[in-house]
């Protein structure tokens, strides 16, 4: 699982007298914020489904796994987790489902050990380009992030203010080249229509990329060539019609790759011939025997692996002089 987990079975709840204590001084070693549960043994703090409207100021310095899920945070300001002394051990931060709609530049600064961040299920209408890099320099200090989970962060359609949501997310991923060490990126369920062409080339360490349940129609301009470490590519439940030769060759050239292509509306016409040939030969596609045609109507539900070139025809396009009205 990509979420921080805890082996803790016993948590100490915060004492009532701490409920209103907001102190600029370092927290006591065994202090637990109001409305949270803490386990020093497991280095874990859970502030879950408590309608918190701000990140607690008095987080214990020992925290390694922090769950802030199911809250009412709305905004993550710059330095939302900056503390004195810093939260030097914090490695896994889960903010999913906390009604965040704005993440500002430098929101995750001063977290030197942060390897795993989950912002899923927040309608991020305003994700700063410098949310993860922390600075607007052309090359930022490398982020320690290894795993970034951004599933279902798309706001409602009428709240996108005519901005490209894909562009906003990609700008945050690429700013300052801070995420060069990122190994897992999950972007499922975000209504992505396209993948900007430069995004993958600048994330060379990726091992796992999840783009499932989006609205991707084509991968024609997406290059996988640089992703030599890529082990899994999830493209299930998109709107892919066909994969062309360039994409097929690039995928085949990746040494460790497993590709997931289920539930796409494959168009089984003459343009599908190369992909069918490739599917029959390749070992990289998981569950390839489940892939079926969606169009044209006469081909619906036919298994791609069972097709031959005679099945894959295109209706001839008549020259204008022969067309009838």
């Amino acid at each position: 699982s990509s979420s921080p987990t805890s082996s803790a079975s016993s948590f100490s709840s915060s004492a009532p007298f701490l409920a209103s204590a907001v102190s600029a001084q370092p927290p006591l070693p065994d202090q637990c914020p109001a409305l949270c549960e803490c386990s020093e043994a497991a280095r874990t703090v859970k502030c879950v489904n408590r309608n918190l409207t701000e990140v607690p100021t008095d987080l214990p310095a020992y925290v390694r796994n922090l769950f802030l899920t199911g809250n009412q945070l709305a905004v993550l300001p710059a330095g939302a987790f900056a503390r004195r002394p810093p939260l030097a051990e914090l490695a896994a931060l889960n903010l999913s489902g906390s009604r965040l709609d704005e993440v500002r530049a430098g929101a995750f600064e001063h977290l030197p050990s942060l390897r795993q961040l989950d912002l899923s299920h927040n309608p991020l209408a305003d994700l700063s380009p410098f949310a993860f890099s922390g600075s607007n320099a052309s090359v930022s200090a490398p982020s320690p992030l290894v795993e970034l989970i951004l599933n279902h962060i798309v706001p409602p359609e009428d709240e996108r203010q005519n901005r490209s949501f894909e562009g906003m997310v990609v700008a945050a991923l690429l700013a300052g080249r801070a995420l060069q060490g990122l190994r897992r990126l999950e972007l499922a369920s975000n209504h992505f229509l396209y993948l900007p062409r430069d995004v993958l080339a600048q994330l060379p360490s990726l091992r796992h990329l999840d783009l499932s349940n989006n609205s991707l129609v084509s991968l024609t301009y997406v290059s996988f060539r640089n992703l030599t470490h890529l082990e899994s590519l999830h493209l299930e439940d998109n709107a892919l019609k066909v994969l062309h030769n360039g994409t097929l060759a690039e995928l085949q050239g990746l040494p460790h790759i497993r590709v997931f292509l289920d539930n796409n509306p494959w168009v089984c016409d003459c343009h599908m011939a190369d992909m069918v040939t490739w599917l029959k030969e390749t070992e990289v596609v998981q569950g390839k025997d489940r892939l079926t045609c969606a169009y044209p109507e006469k081909m619906r539900n036919r298994v791609l692996l069972e097709l031959n070139s005679a099945d894959l025809d295109c209706d001839p396009i008549l020259p204008p002089s022969l067309q009838t009205s």
Epitope: E54, L73, A74, R99, D101, E102, A125
Partner: nanobody
């Protein structure tokens, strides 16, 4: 500048309920938060509740938690404050406000309505 118009105030018996409405003249895209404040004569305006237009996050001052509920209808640019179990100390002029931040201070909000009076009889 966005115009905000409150309605729904009135005279009510202690323990009763009122639903206040705040209609915005247009969707204030630059204002991400809508809030209710209240003010009694000679006192500073006090934060009551807030809601985010997009994510729908809500927050309340401690004295109204469990009694008041803020909600919104994006389609008609309107925010509501459902006030239940009213007490005499809830008597005040209730103001609607729009702002950029997720704050509880008077100064966090730039646009204000004219207010609607809520009177709670003991």
């Amino acid at each position: 500048q966005v115009q905000l118009q409150e309605s729904g105030g009135g005279l009510v018996q202690a323990g009763g309920s009122l639903r206040l409405s705040c209609a915005a003249s247009r969707r204030p895209f630059s204002s991400k938060t809508m809030a209710w404040f209240r003010q009694t004569p000679g006192k500073e305006r006090e934060f009551v509740a807030a809601v985010r237009w997009i994510g729908g996050a809500t927050r309340y001052t401690d004295s109204v938690k469990g009694r008041f509920s803020i909600s919104k209808d994006n389609a008609i640019n309107t925010v509501y404050l459902q006030t239940n179990s009213l007490k005499s100390e809830d008597t005040a002029v209730y103001y609607c406000a729009a702002g950029q931040t997720w704050g509880t201070k008077f100064t966090d909000y730039s646009d204000w309505g004219q207010g609607t009076l809520v009177t709670v009889k003991p």
